[in-house]
Amino acid sequence: IWELKKDVYVVELDWYPDAPGEMVVLTCDTPEEDGITWTLDQSSEVLGSGKTLTIQVKEFGDAGQYTCHKGGEVLSHSLLLLHKKEDGIWSTDILKDQKEPKNKTFLRCEAKNYSGRFTCWWLTTISTDLTFSVKSSRGSSDPQGVTCGAATLSAERVRGDNKEYEYSVECQEDSACPAAEESLPIEVMVDAVHKLKYENYTSSFFIRDIIKPDPPKNLQLKPLKNSRQVEVSWEYPDTWSTPHSYFSLTFCVQVQGKSKREKKDRVFTDKTSATVICRKNASISVRAQDRYYSSSWSEWASVPCS
Amino acid sequence: RAVPGGSSPAWTQCQQLSQKLCTLAWSAHPLVGHMDLREEGDEETTNDVPHIQCGDGCDPQGLRDNSQFCLQRIHQGLIFYEKLLGSDIFTGEPSLLPDSPVGQLHASLLGLSQLLQPEGHHWETQQIPSLSPSQPWQRLLLRFKILRSLQAFVAVAARVFAHGAATLSP
């Protein structure tokens, strides 16, 4: 058993049929010695008396809010949560496996630049009695500070018969060094509590590996005289790291016909303009990627050829 | 060239070669996620690689103030990786074909280090840890780790030279 936060404790249980469970001793936080009784949740049934209460925790019915009283007055509470371990593996019932970029990916994170600011998100089908708490650091043995905000519900989607809820959190490295080569990964830890079930999820990454620039901005077309060619121009996204002579992007320009089956013409360039042939009913799209490190491409910015 | 007197390197040449290094490093090990190498053991093997750290003066301001600290750090790393890529880690099994980008990567690391340090001038270089894994799986794991680490190193070096070529070239 360990303390998650003040008066909230997590009991780690091997979860299999007829498991013996864990013996837990609760102590009433009071100077009083006599006349103390214990109850669980809303029940008025007295579970025991005395300053300590010893219980055998085997299942969710044994978890909950234990309260010690004296003469009708509440002295203190202890909330017990369960963390299940099945076949040596901690349960992952609360969050959905996003399966990208690989199986058992519960947390996904992205950064728009090298400032040390990043966003993580996760999915669940649970709508109520759900709380999350997020901690992060750079490295684990001698951790350097990363500050995370509160997790918030950022999207709701309908998937078949189920509703899916997306939560996200923003974090910022306290003393980020955008130009340095990272040698220690960022660690992100999410504590999830659903009713009386506790689970924790972790992710470890370098900012460089989760970079995804915003799409290029101000995408414009300039027709070239007496030609089907156009000059496409664009700018670096505002959110990208500066100076651009140091934090450079590379770009992919694509001409795509109306039909998905039509052949796509693609040009790669380090410049912020390109000359392409504009076909009727086609659209021109541009996306960006770090020039020197192959992290994710941005989403496309698009304009119609007409 | 970063000669003893501390004059400027051939920023544009260095920029071109460092950008080529980035491309080669990703050709040699294109996959980001097929093996989470930080989850594997053997941490000490790549902990000794020289990283370009915050105080090394490789940020835009540091380069403007005095690029020599940064260039020395980059040179140190280039020599370190060049030695690693020429070692048994990359010559043993699993077999690399002669068209492997590792060969070109090895030559380009040497080429860039020579651009930074002509004959006769010697910066201190870092000691290479003696790594000689006997098993193919250990060797391959080490290769992947070295290449992933090299990708990060050459990305910073390429940014330095791109910025230098754009803002510090005579």
Epitope: - | S95, P101, V102
Partner: antibody
Framework: QVQLVQSGAEVKKPGSSVKVSCKAS????????IHWMRQAPGQGLEWIGY????????KYNENFKGKVTITADKSTSTAYMELSSLRSEDTAVYYC?????????????WGQGTLVTVSS | DIQMTQSPSSLSASVGDRVTITCKAS??????VAWYQQKPGKVPKLLIY???TRHTGVPSRFSGSGSRTDFTLTISSLQPEDVADYFC?????????FGSGTKLEIK
């Protein structure tokens, strides 16, 4: 896109020789090794060897040394595999293939195969 | 030479079944193993490399696992179009060698 086009089927007498060609297009011919494999009827694949056109250096499976000669013609972007002293057990489909760009020998692109039949 | 012992040599399964093919290397090949699918009269097609990485465009029902000497190709839910021969291949050591193949049929 990358393409490997092999020469047509051959029927040969025991003791004779055969030269199979593999014309490459869609990439820089001298940049990559070209490998040869064979597959006898109803059997698995056997790796024969490769040529690296950049320096014309071949490497052979010891089991085929003296039996096979692999060459390349840079001017036509074509690789050749010559089999000598043919025997009935050399009857097989012969494939050329090129590996991944990372320098390891898993094969992404294959020729369509050339059936060599050795029969008296 | 490294022997790649593939089993079973043939196998019949129903549509929707989970199918597993194994390959045993005679010595350590790290994860330098690829899997190919060959349909009748066609050329081999790369499915998996580095023991577990799916090649571009290969359906997610195909997965590979294993390291050092023991490797597995799994088809999570067999489809009619999966009828083919399957080969493993080690590219760790010269001469590169292939398994003898598994003929997969639909019941």
């Amino acid at each position: 896109q990358v393409q490997l086009v092999q020469s047509g089927a051959e029927v040969k007498k025991p003791g004779s020789s055969v030269k199979v060609s593999c014309k490459a297009s869609g990439y820089t011919f001298t940049d990559q090794t070209i490998h040869w494999m064979r597959q006898a009827p109803g059997q698995g694949l056997e790796w024969i060897g490769y040529i690296y056109p950049r320096d014309d250096s071949p490497k052979y499976n010891e089991n085929f040394k003296g039996k096979v000669t692999i060459t390349a013609d840079k001017s036509t972007s074509t690789a050749y595999m010559e089999l000598s002293s043919l025997r009935s057990e050399d009857t097989a489909v012969y494939y050329c293939a090129i590996p991944d760009r990372s320098g390891y020998a898993w094969f992404i692109y294959w020729g369509q195969g050339t059936l060599v039949t050795v029969s008296s | 030479d490294i022997q790649m012992t593939q089993s079973p040599s043939s196998l019949s399964a129903s549509v929707g079944d989970r199918v597993t093919i194994t390959c045993k290397a005679s010595r350590d090949v790290a994860i330098a193993v690829a899997w190919y699918q060959q349909k009748p009269g066609k050329v081999p097609k790369l499915l998996i490399y580095w023991a577990s990485t799916r090649h571009t465009g290969v359906p997610s029902r195909f997965s590979g696992s294993g390291s050092r000497t023991d490797f597995t190709l799994t088809i999570s839910s067999l489809q009619p179009e999966d009828v083919a021969d399957y080969f493993c291949h080690q590219y760790s050591s010269y001469p590169f060698t292939f398994g003898s193949g598994t003929k997969l049929e639909i019941k």
